[in-house]
């Protein structure tokens, strides 16, 4: 009762390997690394056959099929390139994930190279089977911002893409009769979050308590350049409105807030985040030059339709920007203390502007970002948010604009965004 000689499958082997096989002898068929046993269209690791009483084998020898990792998973904001010809996805094939540059960058500078493993899974040396993460690049406009050597008196038209983080925030409270509406600016921090000043998102219906506006009343416009043409802009409603819990309406201390967008916005040449600064209580150094952009929407009678569609009755149709120096804290405190009133320039604020006053201290909407170029990381960093002072008493001598010192709130911002700082390290100025 001897069974016929067995031929191992191509890329496989049989064990035990004997010259002769008799009744009740069993053979295990397995495949080389990177191959799987295929029997009746079913893949398995091994297959056992037995020599029967009548001298036949219980089954035919199966074949060995090369492992296929199949189409790799899609990467959000990323691309896949195949290293092998014909886009092979079989064992030892290589693929490379990359992020949609220059708008996204791979977390931890990962190589993005994945190899099809013997187990049929795309594997990376560092991340294993996990996909890489594409994080938005921050503080790197598609157009180079001008050098900050010369002082600009007054505003200057911004080219499209110069301030890709600039957001126009429109608040329209339809629960009021008549409808209340106002505008502010903000700065994009990620595909889903806008940083702004708390006073922009506070309902003035209450004075003794701080009440945020309802999220249903907030619309954010990104990639907007000329308010008369919103065709190229992305508009988004708000999923959440978060005011700093300690925001004080009497002195605008802790004047910082966040808006979470309903849907992440696609990044591109006109929509890119700004970087957050390091956590540092000193804030920006005195005399450093920063930029503030804004449409200067100041007319109280302008309607939302007019501002977004026609852009009439506004200070400027086109986004404007100014360069302003940071003012030493003591000098700013003194300038406000010398005026009648209980103005307090706290440690959560800094001032910018010129002693002689002028138009440059008036431009920029509330909540807009005061950005400084960080030489080390070669990125633009949001150091301040337009808070109070300048825009109220436009051009007054020695009335500096007061800005929220963002560096005091970095932890709070990350906490609200629900991202541990380590995950978003590339977003932080280094």
């Amino acid at each position: 009762n001897e069974c016929p000689e067995l031929q191992p499958p191509v890329h496989g082997k049989i064990e035990p390997s004997q010259a002769k096989y008799f009744f009740k002898d069993q053979v295990l068929v397995s495949c080389d690394t990177g191959y799987k046993v295929l029997k009746d269209n079913v893949e398995m690791d091994t297959f056992q056959i037995e020599c029967l009483k009548d001298g036949t084998w219980s089954n035919k020898i199966p074949t060995c099929k090369i492992v296929d990792c199949r189409a790799p998973g899609e990467l959000e904001h990323g691309l896949i390139t195949f290293s092998t010809r014909n886009n092979l996805t079989t064992y030892k094939s290589e693929i490379k994930y990359s992020c949609q540059e220059p708008y996204y960058k791979m977390l931890n500078n990962n190589t993005g190279i994945y190899t099809c493993s013997a187990q049929g899974v795309w594997m990376n040396k560092v991340l294993g089977r996990s996909l890489p993460t594409c994080l938005p690049e921050c503080g790197q406009p598609s157009r180079s911002l001008p050098s900050l050597v010369k002082r600009i008196i007054g505003g200057r038209n911004a080219e499209p893409g110069l301030f890709p983080w600039q957001a126009l925030i429109v608040v329209e409270d339809t629960s009021r009769v008549p409808n209340d509406k106002w505008f502010g600016s903000g700065a994009l921090l990620s595909a889903s979050w806008i940083l702004t000043a708390a006073h922009v998102l506070r309902s003035q219906r209450r004075d003794t308590t701080v009440i945020p506006v309802s999220k249903e009343h907030v619309t954010v416009y990104l990639g907007l350049h000329d308010v008369r043409d919103k065709s190229g802009a992305v508009n988004s409603s708000a999923a959440r409105v978060v005011l700093h819990p300690d925001f004080n309406i009497q002195n605008y201390n802790h004047d910082i807030a966040l808006v979470q967008l309903q849907e992440p916005v696609p990044l591109g040449p006109h929509v890119m985040p700004v970087c957050l600064p390091r956590l540092e209580p000193e804030g920006p150094a005195p005399h450093m030059l920063g930029l503030v952009a804004g449409w200067g929407i100041s007319n109280p009678n302008v309607t939302v339709d007019e501002i977004i569609s026609s852009g009439t009755r506004t200070l400027s149709d086109v986004l404007q920007y100014v360069k302003l120096p940071v003012v030493p804290h003591a000098e700013c405190k003194t300038s406000y203390e010398s005026r009648s009133g209980n103005y307090s320039v706290t440690e959560n604020m800094f001032c910018a502007g010129y002693y002689e006053g002028g138009k440059d201290t008036c431009l920029g909407d509330s909540g807009g970002a005061f950005v400084i170029f960080d030489d080390l990381s070669q990125r633009w960093v949001v150091q301040g948010l337009v808070s109070w002072g300048g825009p109220e008493e436009c051009g007054s001598k020695q009335v500096y604009g007061v800005y929220t010192k963002v560096s005091n709130y970095v932890d709070w911002v990350w906490e609200q965004m629900g991202l541990p700082q380590s995950v978003v390290e590339p977003q932080v100025e280094r």
Epitope: P178, D180, Q204, D207
Partner: antibody, heavy 116, light 112 residues
Framework: QIQLVQSGSELKKPGASVKVSCKAS????????MSWVRQAPGKGLKWMGW????????TYADDFKGRFVFSLDTSVRTPYLQISSLKAEDTATYFC?????????WGQGTLVTVSS | DVLMTQTPLSLSVTPGQPASISCKSS???????????LNWLLQRPGQSPKRLIY???KLDSGVPDRFSGSGSGTDFTLKISRVEAEDVGVYYC?????????FGQGTKVEIK
């Protein structure tokens, strides 16, 4: 040092218009709304409405819709109350008060007398 | 509109004695935000009004602690523990919960 300084008394003829100003100082102007309150001679206080100093949007109580207009000049931190087609019953002291609802600081009042 | 009813309409008090003014609203002043926007002010003779108390019981800065406010829902009270000569004038309660804000008719306090 928070102060609301109103314009001086006015004597007007029926049918004329008057504009009362309320110069604010000592606080962040756009942080608080501004209310307007009327007090007829020897009578109590009546809230006329308020203006949002950030948006510039006014809200009027029903009795003060039509001939009464609240406006604003943020650059000089001044809200205004304008009354048109004045009637004898508009004779009153008009107060501005800081806040849409708080009314924690009050101007000294402006007496508007309407008489032929 | 919410009707605010003050009692009494006038009050004559001996210096050093306590005084109490009641203010009732025609509907609850508890707002949807959980706060009660009931305030008290004093208008001294020939002067503009001055707020004394906000959110039912919070004293404005500079207001002597002989003044206190209490109440909830529709019933509120202003108390002066020991009346002084400078306390004379008309006291008004007003609500800032329901639009339009409304004042009580005022309580005139004078010294005996």
């Amino acid at each position: 040092q928070i102060q609301l300084v109103q314009s001086g008394s006015e004597l007007k003829k029926p049918g004329a218009s008057v504009k009362v100003s309320c110069k604010a100082s000592g606080y962040i102007f756009t942080s608080y709304g501004m209310s307007w309150v009327r007090q007829a001679p020897g009578k109590g206080l009546k809230w006329m409405g308020w203006i949002n100093t950030y948006s510039g949007v006014p809200t009027y109580a029903d009795d003060f819709k039509g001939r009464f207009v609240f406006s604003l000049d943020t650059s000089v931190r001044t809200p205004y109350l304008q009354i048109s087609s004045l009637k004898a019953e508009d004779t009153a002291t008009y107060f501005c008060a800081r806040g849409g609802e708080a009314m924690d600081y009050w101007g000294q009042g402006t007496l508007v007398t309407v008489s032929s | 509109d919410v009707l605010m009813t003050q009692t009494p309409l006038s009050l004559s008090v001996t210096p050093g004695q306590p005084a109490s003014i009641s203010c009732k609203s025609s509907q609850s002043l508890l707002d949807s935000d959980g706060k009660t926007y009931l305030n008290w002010l004093l208008q001294r003779p020939g002067q503009s009004p001055k707020r004394l108390i906000y959110l039912v019981s919070k004293l404005d800065s500079g207001v002597p602690d002989r003044f206190s406010g209490s109440g909830s829902g529709t019933d509120f009270t202003l108390k002066i523990s020991r009346v002084e000569a400078e306390d004379v004038g008309v006291y008004y309660c007003w609500q800032g919960t329901h639009f339009p804000w409304t004042f009580g008719q005022g309580t005139k306090v004078e010294i005996k």
